[in-house]
């Protein structure tokens, strides 16, 4: 029977700069029941705080709701593991909410084949930003990436769409069924998961781009 091993805070993520969650990996348990607590202070403060919510983010997590989340403030956090034989502490982790945003995937991806009379046909897609993100505040610039592939192909073809919420693709294989997905990331932060796949059947008479 030993004191617990050193825990590690391995990830902090925010969906929208308004709330965030951090997760830790326990160290070895020393063969005894172990309690974990996350404490933090904000840079410039010495007032120590405890995690306000150990439930929302699941096991070994601390969730910071709206009232605990400050933009422009660096959080300095540490996890304490304690059992009957002693304690151990994680390294301090410095967290700035601005840099840990991982949005939800974009919504309402729609894909259509457009066949104008006077131009080459193309695949047109549009989508909406995730609902948790309020782009009107100007706090966010969201960038988008699209990927698509024929249903049976192994390789994805990826296109960067910048800040647009619509995109055209000209080069497609006629008669194929395509899977299309979109994802987004803030200017500072992490890519979202890919949106659910949307399927589109390319007509056999679709003319390939020269």
């Amino acid at each position: 029977q030993l004191p617990p091993g050193k825990p590690e805070i391995f990830k902090c993520r925010s969906p929208n700069k308004e709330t965030f969650t951090c997760w830790w990996r326990p160290g070895t348990d020393g063969g005894l029941p172990t309690n974990y607590s996350l404490t933090y202070h904000r840079e410039g403060e010495t007032l120590m705080h405890e995690c306000p919510d150990y439930i929302t983010g699941g096991p070994n997590s601390c969730h910071f709701g709206k009232q605990y989340t400050s933009m422009w403030r660096t959080y300095v956090m540490m996890v304490n593991a304690t059992n009957q034989m002693g304690s151990s502490f994680s390294d301090e982790l410095y967290v700035d909410v601005t840099y840990i945003v991982q949005p939800d995937p974009p919504l309402e991806l729609t894909v259509e084949v457009k066949q104008p009379e006077d131009r080459k046909p193309y695949l047109w897609m549009k989508w909406s930003p995730p609902t948790l993100i309020d782009l009107k505040t100007g706090w966010f610039t969201l960038l988008y990436e699209i990927r698509l592939k024929p249903e049976k192909a192994a390789e994805w073809e990826t296109h960067f769409a910048g800040q647009q919420t619509e995109f055209k693709i000209l080069s497609l294989h006629p008669g194929q069924k395509y899977l299309v997905q979109v994802r987004c990331k803030p200017d500072h932060g992490y890519w979202s998961a890919w949106s659910p796949a949307t399927f589109i059947q390319i007509p056999s008479d679709f003319i390939m781009n020269d």
């Epitope: 904000r42 410039g44 010495t46 007032l47 705080h49 405890e50 910071f64 009232q67 605990y68």
Partner: antibody, heavy 118, light 107 residues
Framework: EVQLVESGGGLVQPGGSLRLSCAAS????????MNWVRQAPGKGLEWISY????????YYADSIKGRFTIYRDNARNSLYLQMNSLRAEDTAIYYC???????????WGQGTMVTVSS | DIQMTQSPSSLSASVGDRVTITCRAS??????LAWYQQKPGKVPKLLIY???TLQSGVPSRFSGGGSGTDFTLTISSLQPEDVATYYC?????????FGGGTKVEIK
């Protein structure tokens, strides 16, 4: 409605003891850090104690250190202040105050009066 | 411990006047400063935090400024309902010290 209600004040002799209670309702008490602030008659506000959400971190003002104890019972949504070795200068209205997530007192109770006199 | 000094300790001004209260910290506290209003016989009420962020529901005639050691609370146009004592408070570390208060009255 978010509310804090203090009780337990009264008249006590110097050297005596008193326990103040603060009952919280309308919010998730266990997620918030809590404080006691007092105000002597005709005087300003004086912060006297802080307790973190699960009770692991506690701070006291020098004026009460060693005489007063702050503690909480999250199951009962209650905050307490055990006051021992009371002095005349402890006479004041005692407020419990919720510390918001950005460390300011956003909700206050109505206060309970403590009078220390022989 | 860091001391918070408010000035003036009291002032009298006319309705519509611009009123400024100052608060000085004995050491730098970044912008970890709040202002509270306490009307006679009432409980203190939060006005401003992070030195300049207006608490929800507080009239826009109240504003805060400053950083480091020197801070101000300004009432742009004094109203009869603003008669109160105003307190600054630092909250970057314990003790969470209040200033001595400034009593604002109407002439």
């Amino acid at each position: 409605e978010v509310q804090l209600v203090e009780s337990g004040g009264g008249l006590v002799q110097p050297g005596g003891s008193l326990r103040l209670s603060c009952a919280a309702s309308g919010f998730t008490f266990s997620s918030y850090e809590m404080n006691w602030v007092r105000q002597a008659p005709g005087k300003g506000l004086e912060w006297i104690s802080y307790i973190s959400s699960r009770g692991g971190t506690i701070y006291y003002a020098d004026s009460i250190k060693g005489r007063f104890t702050i503690y909480r019972d999250n199951a009962r949504n209650s905050l307490y202040l055990q006051m021992n070795s009371l002095r005349a200068e402890d006479t004041a209205i005692y407020y419990c105050a919720r510390l918001s997530g950005v460390d300011i007192f956003d909700i206050w109770g109505q206060g309970t009066m403590v009078t220390v006199s022989s | 411990d860091i001391q918070m000094t408010q000035s003036p300790s009291s002032l009298s001004a006319s309705v519509g006047d611009r009123v400024t209260i100052t608060c000085r910290a004995s050491q730098g506290i970044s912008n970890y400063l709040a202002w509270y209003q306490q009307k006679p016989g009432k409980v203190p009420k939060l006005l401003i935090y992070f030195a300049s962020t207006l608490q929800s529901g507080v009239p826009s005639r109240f504003s805060g400024g400053g950083s480091g050691t020197d801070f101000t609370l300004t009432i742009s146009s004094l109203q009869p309902e603003d008669v109160a004592t105003y307190y600054c408070q630092r909250y970057n570390s314990a003790p969470l010290t209040f200033g001595g208060g400034t009593k604002v009255e109407i002439k």
